[in-house]
Amino acid sequence: EVEKTACPSGKKAPEIDESLIFYKKWELEACVDAALLATQMDRVNAIPFTYEQLDVLKHKLDELYPQGYPESVIQHLGYLFLKMSPEDIRKWNVTSLETLKALLEVNKGHEMSPQVATLIDRFVKGRGQLDKDTLDTLTAFYPGYLCSLSPEELSSVPPSSIWAVRPQDLDTCDPRQLDVLYPKARLAFQNMNGSEYFVKIQSFLGGAPTEDLKALSQQNVSMDLATFMKLRTDAVLPLTVAEVQKLLGPHVEGLKAEERHRPVRDWILRQRQDDLDTLGLGLQGGIPNGYLVLDLSMQEALS
């Protein structure tokens, strides 16, 4: 905290300008009027205040707005945002996407800080849902944003927002998150034709059930191995050799290189060796000929 001292004669700031950078911290405290600062916040970012001087400016705003800053001030915080704590931000009511963008710009190129996480949380909660424009903005600044949300939080994403999602935005999502996002994507893209639909849905397929994979296998989609390897193991296991062959198309040859990795390894163990041999890839580990396969889960269901 800066001590209260009288402003030296002739140093009272008539406006917020660059002459203030040469003021000592106590002079800034004594000679800059908080109300003037609030009305001229748009100038602050263009002035090369030091990080220490920004402390004083923050202190002045805190005194002026003990219940939290108005959006007119928040919008122009610029580098002052770096001085805010999550506790400060929880007092704010940010409704404008432009304000959000302006503050995210300050943190650009850095990992998501607790301040940014709190800001986003406040903004999204205020909006009630993660709409397309917000998601567009957030994933532009933080490609991993979507995958940082819990499945519960993702459930509030409307299907219309899925159009804003790029493949790289899903890179770090786990199966539980894709389980939530996939049905939304399916709904969002349902009116697209086959090949266009596959291009859009491809990055969400880690959440697809068996019946959807079976349906895709009938559409000559030629799924690449990278996508196939991200599918849910439980969704892949019931697929027949013929269905996998149709699903992968020319990429089926890549199964050989992945035969020791999930889900390929587990899928191989469920197939008849005879059927695997028809692929001509030398895949080993299938069920030997003459063995009877009992589906115990089916038996339990019948009893």
């Epitope: 000592k24 263009a46 090369p48 030091t50 990080y51 220490e52 580098y79 770096l82």
Partner: antibody
Framework: QVQLQQPGAELVKPGASVKLSCKAS????????MHWVKQRPGQGLEWIGM????????NYNEKFKSKATLTVDKSSSTAYMQLSSLTSEDSAVYYC????????????WGTGTTVTVSS | DIVMTQSQKFMSTTVGDRVSITCKAS??????VAWYQQKPGQSPKLLIY???NRYTGVPDRFTGSGSGTDFTLTISNMQSEDLADYFC?????????FGAGTKLELK
């Protein structure tokens, strides 16, 4: 990558002026302040001042106010510093440097220009 | 103006040593201090910023510490390529000021 290119050396006569250049590449020139720093042989570094290429706004160390004039040419992404009324005290290496805002430490330095004032 | 004092102009060292270079500010600068390394004929290179944060690509044998008026740059395992001049800089207030430098030499 981010680079600040400066001419290697300038030989000037006492009383004359010299205009040093600093050509920026690898980043958006108009988005960063450009600072200038002086280093005399075997001595420390002295901050001269800074200019914002977008606005042309300048701020000087009081000590160099009557010695240095900072300008920019946005079209060529080049910053300039004119030094006037040169004396042997001005013989030094001059660096341009890009700061990290709002912390004002320098993550990118120019290659430096050695100014020699001699008759 | 804030004066940054590096009391040792020269320091003798050997490879493998732990070396501590000090810098004292004439008034409180918080943690607004950076450290630079400069080799002969080269530009300064940023090592440490905000008193203790290592800049990208700087080996972890370099560490910075301190706040207020007293700051230290430590090289935990001196290497021959670390022989250079080291400068501190404060960015708490204008004008920005630097220390006079400490030159590391071989014993």
């Amino acid at each position: 990558q981010v680079q600040l290119q400066q001419p290697g050396a300038e030989l000037v006569k006492p009383g004359a002026s010299v205009k040093l250049s600093c050509k920026a590449s690898g980043y958006t020139f108009t988005s960063y302040w450009m600072h200038w720093v002086k280093q005399r042989p075997g001595q420390g570094l002295e901050w001269i001042g800074m200019i914002h290429p977008n606005s042309g706004s300048t701020n000087y160390n009081e000590k160099f106010k009557s010695k240095a004039t900072l300008t920019v040419d946005k079209s060529s992404s080049t910053a300039y510093m004119q030094l006037s009324s040169l004396t042997s005290e001005d013989s030094a290496v001059y660096y341009c440097a890009r700061p990290v805002v709002p912390y004002w430490y320098f993550d990118v330095w120019g290659t430096g220009t050695t100014v020699t004032v001699s008759s | 103006d804030i004066v940054m004092t590096q009391s040792q102009k020269f320091m003798s060292t050997t490879v493998g040593d732990r070396v501590s270079i000090t810098c004292k500010a004439s008034q409180n600068v918080g943690t607004a201090v950076a450290w630079y390394q400069q080799k002969p004929g080269q530009s300064p290179k940023l090592l440490i910023y905000s008193a203790s944060n290592r800049y990208t690509g700087v080996p972890d044998r370099f560490t910075g510490s301190g706040s207020g008026t007293d700051f230290t740059l430590t090289i935990s395992n001196m290497q021959s390529e670390d022989l250079a001049d080291y400068f501190c800089q404060q960015s708490s207030s204008y004008p920005l000021t630097f220390g006079a430098g400490t030159k590391l030499e071989l014993k």
